[in-house]
C-alpha cells in the first residue's frame, strides 16, 4: 500500500567551509506527513514536525539550519561531513519513506555540485 516515492538531491559535492542544501520530496501518495527526520548515519540531525515545527539537535545547532521547506541546510562544511544523509518521512497510514543523499566535501576549490533540485 506504500505507493509513494522519494526524490532526493542524490549524490552531491561541496567545498570545505561552504554550505549545501539537502532536499527530499515525497510524491505519488495521499498519505499525510506528520514528521520528517534528518539523520547522518545513525545520528539525528533535525526533526521537522507538522505540529511543533523544527527541532535541531543541540550538537548541530551551530552548523545546521532548517529549510528550505522540509529540507536542511548544512553550513561550515568540513571533510568529516562527507557521508550518507537520510530523510525519513513519517506518514499516515503508509508508514516511513526513506531517501538517501551522499555528500562529498572536497578540499579542492573546485567542487562539482549535483543537479540542484527544486521543490515545486
Amino acid at each position: 500500500m506504500m505507493t509513494g516515492t522519494i526524490e532526493t538531491t542524490g549524490n552531491i559535492s561541496a567545498e570545505k567551509g561552504g554550505s549545501i542544501i539537502l532536499q527530499c520530496h515525497l510524491s505519488s501518495t495521499t498519505a499525510q506527513v506528520t514528521q520528517v527526520n534528518w539523520e547522518q548515519q545513525d545520528q539525528l540531525l533535525a526533526i521537522c514536525n507538522a505540529d511543533l515545527g523544527w527541532h535541531i539537535s543541540p550538537s548541530f545547532k551551530d552548523r545546521v539550519a532548517p529549510g528550505p521547506g522540509l529540507g536542511l541546510t548544512l553550513q561550515s562544511l568540513t571533510v568529516n561531513d562527507t557521508g550518507e544523509y537520510f530523510c525519513i518521512y513519517h506518514t499516515y497510514p503508509d508508514g516511513t519513506y526513506t531517501g538517501r543523499i551522499f555528500l562529498e566535501v572536497l578540499e579542492s576549490s573546485v567542487a562539482e555540485h549535483g543537479a540542484r533540485f527544486q521543490i515545486p
Partner: antibody, heavy 122, light 106 residues
C-alpha cells in the same frame, strides 16, 4: 483542552442524506489526520477511512465507497461525514477520531468525538 | 487487509483479579498495535499504543506486550471502573480493529 465535538443525533428516512460534523479545538487541525469509525448497535468498531487534513484528500475503506463522503472546512477546524441514499443498515454511531503521535511508532487514535447516533427508519 | 482476532470475546472476572486479553494478527505488524477501552454509550478511550506504551493519564495497572503477531493487554488488579469492552487495533497498514473483549462482573 484538545477535543472533538460532534453534531447531535439524527433520525432519517431511507433514501435521505445526513451530514455529521466533527469540530476540533485545542490543537493544530491540519497537522493530524482524521478518521471516521462506525459502530452498529451492539457491534464492534469498524474503520471507515480517513481524510488528510493537510490536503483534504479522503481515503475510504472497503465497503464505504460511493455513498460516503469525507470533507473538511479548515477555516473552522471541522471534518464532515456525509452519507447519501441512507439504508436501515446505516443505523449506527459514527465517531471521528484523530491520529495522535508524530512518528509512525506512536500512531493511535488518541482523541475521539463523543459519537453521533444516526438512525434510519421509515 | 490485516485481520485481528481477540480472545476471549467475553470474560467474567472479579474486582482484584488479574485479567489478560490476547490479540492475534493475521500477519506481522511489528509493534504497531493500540488498545482501547469502551464503556456503554461512550467513545473508545486510548489505553496503550506502540504495543506497550501507556497513554498519558491511564492507570499503571494496565500494561501491554507483544510484537509481530501476538499481543496481550493485562490488567494487574481489576477495578470496578474497568468493567468495559476492550479493542485492539493495528496501524501497520490501513487500520483494523479486533472484535472486542467484554469484561463482565462475575
Amino acid at each position: 483542552e484538545v477535543q472533538l465535538v460532534q453534531s447531535g443525533s439524527e433520525l432519517k428516512k431511507p433514501g435521505a442524506s445526513v451530514k455529521v460534523s466533527c469540530k476540533a479545538s485545542g490543537y493544530t487541525f491540519t497537522a493530524y489526520p482524521m478518521n471516521w469509525v462506525r459502530q452498529a448497535p451492539g457491534q464492534g468498531l469498524e474503520w471507515m477511512g480517513w481524510i488528510n487534513t493537510n490536503t483534504g484528500n479522503p481515503t475510504y475503506a472497503q465497503g464505504f465507497t460511493g455513498r460516503f463522503v469525507f470533507s473538511l472546512d479548515t477555516s473552522v477546524s471541522t471534518a464532515y461525514l456525509q452519507i447519501s441514499s441512507l439504508k436501515a443498515e446505516d443505523t449506527a454511531v459514527y465517531y471521528c477520531a484523530r491520529v495522535g503521535g508524530y512518528s509512525v511508532y506512536d500512531y493511535a487514535f488518541d482523541i475521539w468525538g463523543q459519537g453521533t447516533m444516526v438512525t434510519v427508519s421509515s | 487487509d490485516i485481520q485481528l482476532t481477540q480472545s476471549p470475546s467475553f470474560l467474567s472476572a472479579s474486582v482484584g483479579d488479574r485479567v489478560t486479553i490476547t490479540c492475534r494478527a493475521s500477519q506481522g505488524i511489528s509493534s504497531y498495535l493500540a488498545w482501547y477501552q469502551q464503556k456503554p454509550g461512550k467513545a473508545p478511550k486510548l489505553l496503550i499504543y506502540a504495543a506497550s506504551t501507556l497513554q498519558s493519564g491511564v492507570p499503571s495497572r494496565f500494561s501491554g506486550s507483544g510484537s509481530g503477531t501476538e499481543f496481550t493487554l493485562t490488567i494487574s488488579s481489576l477495578q470496578p471502573e474497568d468493567f468495559a469492552t476492550y479493542y485492539c487495533q493495528q496501524l501497520n497498514s490501513y487500520p483494523t480493529f479486533g472484535g472486542g473483549t467484554k469484561v463482565e462482573i462475575k
